[in-house]
């Protein structure tokens, strides 16, 4: 039975040209995390595999940095980076847990972080 929950940074804002950390955290389970995928709806940004380490998609190599931890840092943000980002935790023996983050990249200098929230 899957008992875990994914906590994410929820809805977040950042300034154009700046950087942001996408972070998910799996809690309430003793399952072993073996891989984490970072994705958008139609493309994969990065994979962190326990055995193979990090893989960053060539499309994002210049602007994406692995970490901190299992998170992902997006740099040199543009308004086109606005949208949904998904963390997909592959675990043993539970299976997969997924979380959603919505990033809004703002033109102005008023960019506030949204509240943290949980996805069961």
């Amino acid at each position: 039975m899957m008992t875990g929950t994914i906590e994410t940074t929820g809805n977040i804002s950042a300034e154009k040209g700046g950087s942001i950390i996408l972070q998910c955290h799996l809690s309430s389970t003793t399952a072993q995390v073996t891989q984490v995928n970072w994705e958008q709806q139609d493309q994969l940004l990065a994979i962190c595999n326990a055995d193979l380490g990090w893989h960053i998609s060539p499309s994002f190599k210049d602007r994406v940095a692995p970490g901190p931890g299992l998170g992902l840092t997006l740099q040199s943000l543009t308004v086109n980076d606005t949208g949904e980002y998904f963390c997909i935790y592959h675990t043993y023996p539970d299976g997969t847990y997924t979380g959603r983050i919505f990033l809004e990249v703002l033109e102005s200098s008023v960019a506030e972080h949204g509240a943290r929230f949980q996805i069961p």
Epitope: Q43, L44, I47, H55, S57
Partner: antibody
Framework: QVQLQQSGAEVKKPGASVKVSCKAS????????IEWVKQAPGQGLEWIGV????????NYNEKFKGRATITADKSTSTAYMELSSLRSEDTAVYFC??????????????WGQGTTVTVSA | DIVMTQSPSSLSASVGDRVTITCKAS??????VAWYQQKPGKAPKLLIY???YRYSGVPSRFSGSGSGTDFTLTISSLQPEDFATYYC?????????FGQGTKVEIK
């Protein structure tokens, strides 16, 4: 349990259009992406496109852009794939499929039974 | 588009045999590969996702491995119900693409 029920077989003339439906049940329709896949007779699988039923946003294989239109009706939990300007090479079985996890990667865990479309003069 | 090339295109095997099907991607797809089984007149069934993760309810005789460009589906001891066509698929980028299929037939 999750079910994707597709509409029945269609026979169409070249140049016509066909609209295939895929009615979802057993889960929250707006939370999961729906994909469409083509399989020509004796051939492999070819991805057509995807829709997010919650937002209506979609993405297409370039090969089908302009001829395929994928839509979703939240009120009936039904996804549609319309193919226009039909030609003989569109004769195929068309499947709808759902990703395995909410927000999940594009592996397809649940499939409709398939709809056979025959294009013949 | 990423091209997925499967081999062999068909093979003959007996019940109890160990069967290996390979899939080669035209570019690095990390571990973003799924495997499906399809029987005539039926929809495909998901066996493996992310190269090596067995989907819920799939028998343990099915296993997947590989990363980068080379991937393998192994059936450790072929059962009568395993005679079917198997497809690999990359879930790395759009458009999603499939291998051409490997038909596993009874020897």
């Amino acid at each position: 349990q999750v079910q994707l029920q597709q509409s029945g077989a269609e026979v169409k003339k070249p140049g016509a259009s066909v609209k295939v439906s895929c009615k979802a049940s057993g889960y929250a329709f707006t939370n999961y992406l729906i994909e469409w896949v083509k399989q020509a007779p004796g051939q492999g699988l070819e991805w057509i496109g995807v829709i997010n039923p919650g937002s209506g946003g979609n993405n297409y294989n370039e090969k089908f852009k302009g001829r395929a239109t994928i839509t979703a009706d939240k009120s009936t939990s039904t996804a549609y794939m319309e193919l226009s300007s039909l030609r003989s090479e569109d004769t195929a079985v068309y499947f709808c499929a759902r990703r395995g996890d909410k927000y999940g990667s594009a592996w397809f865990a649940y499939w409709g039974q398939g709809t056979t479309v025959t294009v013949s003069a | 588009d990423i091209v997925m090339t499967q081999s062999p295109s068909s093979l003959s095997a007996s019940v109890g045999d160990r069967v290996t099907i390979t899939c080669k991607a035209s570019q690095d797809v990390s571990t973003a590969v799924a495997w499906y089984q399809q029987k005539p007149g039926k929809a495909p069934k998901l066996l493996i996702y992310s190269a090596s993760y067995r989907y819920s309810g799939v028998p343990s005789r099915f296993s997947g491995s590989g990363s980068g460009t080379d991937f393998t589906l192994t059936i450790s001891s072929l059962q009568p119900e395993d005679f079917a066509t198997y497809y690999c698929q990359q879930h790395y980028s759009s458009p999603r693409t499939f291998g051409q299929g490997t038909k596993v037939e009874i020897k």
